[in-house]
């Protein structure tokens, strides 16, 4: 979907010595590392599923597509890709795959291309808050990230190390300010229970986010009204109830927005009555006429749009005088 | 300081197999790499193969590629390393070690075991 693409109908392959072999002279600008495949007319180079433990030392200087799929990486240290000369042209960089556990700080420093990053599918149990911006810094200097794929990077359940996950890739996104013209984010498929609430006031050009496949029950702290250039905003597959009346305001004052709500457990009660109202007023859900009740039982799989307000209705509450036992 | 111990280990014939097992004495969280070393007689402890605790990502050493393969079971806090095809060179020592680097360094590992003896001969 997101990674670099390549336009390379021919590669050279490079001698099968050890991928970890560290060359202490600049490469020599038609070499290609160990266990790589590079197109200089297409400035690519795939180091795919080769099980590398080592991000190569010796990469080409032209490279401007970089894939490094499928290895055994499991830590990013800083400056993992800086070489002398700097890899200038470094403009898309794909890791998915490739087992990372740890990504320090400053792991992407020296790249000053990079516009593409791709980290997803793998298991970023210590993703350190200063991965993008490089330094501790209150502001950074911009990042000239332009897209981010964190997909599936959560670890399972155990190895999460008793602290917030959301949490831990959020202080990443903010550090320094240094996303500020990111304009695509992934997110998709994390587990994450809740969006904290700093993360989209601070991230302005976003054009599209996808937070699918989540767990997300509600959106009540989550502000949008920064996000005038949000084009895209992926919500399905989560655990959301309903949206309430601020959330919607702000979303039909984005002018630009598409927003996707399927597979959510909508739940038709009498909360439900102004969002079934504004759905059938709005253009900006994708798909719409695809929503259904998932609660209550007598409501299940009925059409949002097809609602009316009779049919949302909220069992009353007893006092506790009136409770029968 | 997490406590190590090694079993597994014997005398096997060349192109036998082996299984050897490390349990640890509790979930060494700060100790993101498990790895085997081994020491054969008069020669220095040489890196066999790492894994991470998360991750699961592996390495090896050139000579053990194909024939040996590490693994470890997080909920049994348990390090294995199977060893098939087994050579006279690969007699020795064979020491389970935690540490923090995904090296294949002695010095990159801050706990070890005491060893367990592999003896591969006719």
């Known amino acids: 979907s997101s990674s670099p693409t390549s336009s390379a109908s021919s590669f050279s392959s490079s001698a099968p010595f050890l991928a970890s072999a560290v060359s202490a002279q600049p490469p020599l600008p038609d070499q290609c590392p160990a266990l790589c495949e590079c197109s200089e007319a297409a400035r690519t180079v795939k180091c795919v599923n080769r099980n590398l433990t080592e991000v190569p030392t010796d990469l080409p200087a032209y490279v401007r597509n970089l894939f490094l799929t499928g290895n055994q990486l499991a830590v990013l240290p800083a400056g993992a890709f800086a070489r002398r000369p700097p890899l200038a042209e470094l403009a898309a960089l794909n890791l998915s795959g490739s087992r990372l556990d740890e990504v320090r700080a400053g792991a992407f420093e020296h790249l000053p291309s990079l516009r593409q990053l791709d980290l997803s599918h793998n298991p970023l149990a210590d993703l350190s808050p200063f991965a993008f911006s490089g330094s501790n810094a209150s502001v950074s200097a911009p990042s000239p990230l332009v897209e981010l794929i964190l997909n599936h990077i959560v670890p399972p359940e155990d190895e999460r190390q008793n602290r917030s996950f959301e949490g831990m890739v959020v202080a990443a996104l903010l550090a320094g300010r240094a996303l500020q013209g990111l304009r695509r984010l992934e997110l998709a498929s994390n587990h994450f229970l809740y969006l904290p609430r700093d993360v989209l006031a601070q991230l302005p050009s976003l054009r599209h986010l996808d937070l699918s496949n989540n767990s997300l029950v509600s959106l009540t702290y989550v502000s949008f009204r920064n996000l005038t250039h949000l084009e895209s905003l992926h919500l399905e597959d989560n655990a959301l109830k309903v949206l309430h009346n601020g959330t919607l305001a702000e979303l039909q004052g984005l002018p630009h927005i598409r927003v996707f709500l399927d597979n959510n457990p909508w739940v038709c009660d009498c909360h439900m009555a102004d969002m079934v109202t504004w759905l059938k007023e709005t253009e900006v859900v994708q798909g719409k006429d695809r929503l259904t009740c998932a609660y209550p039982e007598k409501m299940r799989n009925r059409v949002l749009l097809e609602l009316n307000s009779a049919d949302l209705d909220c069992d009353p509450i007893l006092p506790p005088s009136l409770q029968t036992s | 300081e997490v406590q190590l111990v090694e079993s597994g280990g014997g005398e096997v014939q060349p192109g036998g197999s082996l299984r050897l097992s490390c349990a640890a004495s509790r979930r060494p969280f700060s100790s993101k790499t498990m790895a085997w070393f081994r020491q054969a007689p008069g020669k220095e402890r040489e890196f066999v193969a790492a894994?991470?605790?998360?991750?699961?990502?592996?390495r090896y050493t050139e000579s053990v590629k194909g024939r040996f393969t590490i693994s470890r079971d997080n909920a049994k806090n348990t390090l294995y390393l199977q060893m098939s095809s087994l050579r006279a060179e690969d007699t020795a020592v064979y020491y389970c070690a935690a540490g923090q680097a995904w090296g294949t360094k002695f010095t990159d590992y801050s706990d070890w075991g005491q060893g367990t003896l592999v003896t591969v001969k006719p």
């Open positions: 894994v991470r605790w998360i991750g699961g990502a592996t």
